[in-house]
């Protein structure tokens, strides 16, 4: 379900603002963790201090483990390897849209979007374009907001990711 037009009240785990705040924290942590492990450097990304509650920690760990699984997904690796970074914005949104082109949504694909963003960040670090890192995060959150938010609300918020973990494929 793509979408804006969210119809739920404010507050609680399914409010649009809470989903986007949590999404931003999770994306930031995911990118920093992967950049730290793969490139040996942790980019300065802090939008806001992530809440250190047990639920967010659990979600972060869940994302990390799914991300590690995606390292061995050859189809996703091919998709990312084909990315031409000459016009990154257009490419980012094309690849992101392709991930959901059939109109089917699942948590694996949401994490694959974060994974794709982290790979672009690693490329930016390697090519010494650090200012692109914050921009990539912005693109990812914009896509999440415009195309995935209502679906995440329908899953009961980010907590739905925890019950999904164990399904290995992003497809």
């Amino acid at each position: 379900m793509d979408g804006s037009g969210e119809q739920l009240g404010s507050g609680g785990p399914t409010s649009s603002e809470q989903i986007m705040k949590t999404g931003a924290f999770l994306l930031q942590g995911f990118i920093q963790d992967r950049a730290g492990r793969m490139a040996g450097e942790t980019p300065e990304l802090t939008l806001e201090q992530p809440p250190q509650d047990a639920s967010t920690k659990k979600l972060s760990e869940c994302l990390r483990r799914i991300g590690d699984e995606l390292d061995s997904n050859m189809e996703l690796q091919r998709m990312i390897a084909d990315v031409d970074t000459d016009s990154p914005r257009e490419v980012f949104f094309r690849v992101a849209a392709d991930m959901f082109a059939d109109g089917n949504f699942n948590w694996g694909r949401v994490v694959a979007l974060f994974y794709f963003a982290s790979k672009l960040v690693l490329k930016a670090l390697c090519t010494k374009v650090p200012e692109l890192i914050r921009t990539i995060m912005g693109w990812t959150l914009d896509f999440l907001r415009e195309r995935l938010l209502v679906w995440i609300q329908d899953q009961g918020g980010w907590e739905g990711l925890l019950s999904y973990f164990g399904t290995p494929t992003w497809q």
């Epitope: 379900m1 804006s4 603002e17 912005g138 914009d142 907001r145 415009e146």
Partner: antibody, heavy 115, light 107 residues
């Protein structure tokens, strides 16, 4: 209650400029994309420009690219459309709308470009 | 840019009729499609988003569906207040596009 109120329309000569404002209330524009859509007299809806909240990415219709600029001031909870080098074919009612699936619209403001 | 080809451009129907309006996207837009109703002198109103989700407060006689790149708005039983112009719109990302509009008139 969510509300969008446009202002700044009026009569302007070809080549002139106008700045449209879209004051939002009942929600925080920091979390929403904002869009301008216009409708020429007796014609259909034409998307003009969009601004996205997290990357501040902006997009424009080919017909206005290089002449119009969309922006947002989150401290004022207001979106803007700066229109330069106006042409007769820019005459239309201009609406601002919230989100990509445009769930809330303003009442519209009329821009007339004529000598 | 993605084009949205809407048909028919106008139609005449009677109260109680089933009305179908179609939009074809020039390329895949997933289900990032919305439908709007507009009455003269008024701003458009959102009816359907995400191709098939009914917006809050919209009567259930309105429905949307998707088949590939074809999107359909159906009014199951036309009511007097439904005579208006209807537009489809895609927001796949980047440039947004609207269909040309379908005017639903009284037969």
């Amino acid at each position: 209650e969510v509300q969008l109120v446009e202002s700044g329309g009026g009569l302007v000569q070809p080549g002139g400029s106008l700045r449209l404002s879209c004051a939002a209330s009942g929600f925080n524009i920091s979390y929403y994309s904002m869009h301008w859509v216009r409708q020429a007299p007796g014609k259909g809806l034409e998307w003009v420009a969009s601004i996205y909240p997290y990357s501040s990415s902006t997009y424009y219709a080919d017909s206005v690219k290089g002449r119009f600029t969309i922006s947002a001031d989150t401290s004022k909870n207001t979106a803007y459309l700066q229109m330069n080098s106006l042409r007769a074919e820019d005459t239309a009612v201009y609406y601002c709308a919230r989100s990509s699936a445009m769930d809330y619209w303003g009442q519209g403001t009329l821009v007339t470009v004529s000598s | 840019d993605i084009q949205m080809t809407q048909s028919p451009s106008s139609l005449s129907a009677s109260v109680g009729d089933r009305v179908t309006i179609t939009c074809r996207a020039s390329q895949s837009v997933s289900s990032a499609v919305a439908w709007y109703q507009q009455k003269p002198g008024k701003a458009p109103k959102l009816l359907i988003y995400s191709a098939s989700s009914l917006y809050s407060g919209v009567p259930s006689r309105f429905s949307g569906s998707r088949s590939g790149t074809d999107f359909t708005l159906t009014i199951s039983s036309l009511q007097p207040e439904d005579f208006a112009t209807y537009y489809c719109q895609q927001w796949s990302f980047g440039p947004i596009t609207f269909g040309q509009g379908t005017k639903v008139e009284i037969k």
